[in-house]
């Protein structure tokens, strides 16, 4: 392993379908790929009307987007699909919503020192 | 890299059951999802069920509900697909297919596909 | 059942043309969309997972977008290779459920 990274093994394994798709809700899911690419975790997951409700989670692909990121953060603003990955075993435990504020905001807008987390 | 390869072509009687092995190659084996997915010739391609050999369950899709049984034999890692009742519109090519990952993000990795022809 | 539907069913083109395929879902499918191309015999491969993500080893004239219910694979600079039949498959949820395909024919 390359020194500071996080190498990813395993993420939790969610499915929203379980019931319907007939696997386990929750598991722990051993990541492959290949031999050179690099591995995450993720989460998806819907916000209706200010109720969080998980998709999917589980191992993700080689992603640029993912590199170095320890924690599962999502950085759109009001995104159609909430989505976040990371680098480390299980990092996809905990996920939040953080928008990266626009510098043209009216500064009345607070920004949430803090993302938060859900799980 | 995972390999799968696929029992041979197979000629059955409507109202009869096929069997079709599916042999995976490559790292853990249990750790897998696979799926059956069939083309009847000149058609689109109908996913059929899965498998997580390590949960053992399958999933299996509405229409054929009933018919077709999915299991895994972690000793010999090999996946099966079995279709009972067959009809002549089960006359196809199988594919057993690899996941990305559980999540089911995309098949990549197919094998070479079985032809079972249904004919009186 | 989410229903797939494609647009073209098929259509022509010349090497070094552009062309864009459509794919629609019945209800969202969130991004949980995948591109395959088949060549008459063979399996399909996998193109596009996630609506854009390009699968390992997939040439770069490939690119996938959209999300929910509308999506499209485009072909930049199309190859001889390229001139196949393209499926896309939602991942959403079970029963996963296939377009009819689109064949790319050499005009």
């Known amino acids: 392993a390359i020194l500071g990274r996080s190498e990813t093994q395993e993420c939790l394994f969610f499915n929203a379908n379980w019931e319907k798709d007939r696997t386990n809700q929750t598991g722990v899911e051993p990541c492959y790929g290949d031999k050179d690419k690099r591995r995450h975790c993720f989460a998806t997951w819907k916000n209706i009307s200010g109720s969080i409700e998980i998709v999917k989670q589980g191992c993700w692909l080689d992603d640029i987007n993912c590199y170095d990121r320890t924690d599962c953060v999502e950085k759109k603003d009001s995104p159609e699909v909430y989505f976040c990955c990371c680098e480390g075993n299980m990092c996809n435990e905990k996920f939040s919503y953080f928008p990266e504020m626009e510098v043209t905001q009216p500064t009345s807008n607070p920004v949430t020192p803090k993302p938060p987390y859900y799980n | 890299q995972v390999q799968l390869v696929q029992s041979g072509a197979e000629v059955k009687k409507p109202g009869s059951s096929v069997k079709v092995s599916c042999k995976a190659s490559?790292?853990?084996?249990?750790?897998?999802?696979i799926s059956w997915v069939r083309q009847a010739p000149g058609q689109g391609l109908e996913w059929m069920g899965g498998?997580?050999?390590?949960?053992?369950?399958?999933n299996y899709a509405q229409k054929f509900q009933g018919r077709v049984t999915i299991t895994a034999d972690e000793s010999t890692s090999t996946a099966y697909m079995e279709l009972s009742s067959l009809r002549s519109e089960d006359t196809a090519v199988y594919y057993c297919?690899?996941?990305?990952?559980?999540?089911?993000?995309?098949?990549?990795?197919w094998g070479q596909g079985t032809m079972v022809t249904v004919s009186s | 059942e989410i229903v797939m539907t494609q647009s073209p069913s098929s259509l022509s083109a010349s090497v070094g043309d552009t062309v864009t395929i459509t794919c629609r879902a019945s209800?969202?499918?969130?991004?949980?969309l995948a591109w395959y191309q088949q060549k008459p015999g063979k399996a399909p491969r996998l193109l596009i997972y996630?609506?854009?993500h390009l699968q390992s080893g997939v040439p770069s004239r490939f690119s996938g977008s959209g999300s929910g219910t509308h999506f499209t694979l485009t072909i930049s600079s199309l190859q001889p290779e390229d001139f196949a039949t393209y499926f896309c498959?939602?991942?959403?949820?079970?029963?996963?459920?296939f377009g009819p395909g689109t064949k790319l024919e050499i005009k």
């Open positions: 209800q969202g499918v969130s991004r949980w």
């Open positions: 498998i997580i050999p390590i949960y053992g369950t399958a």
């Open positions: 297919v690899k996941d990305l990952t559980w999540t089911n993000l995309g098949l990549d990795i």
């Open positions: 490559g790292p853990r084996f249990q750790d897998l999802s």
């Open positions: 498959q939602q991942s959403y949820s079970t029963p996963f459920t």
């Open positions: 996630w609506a854009a």
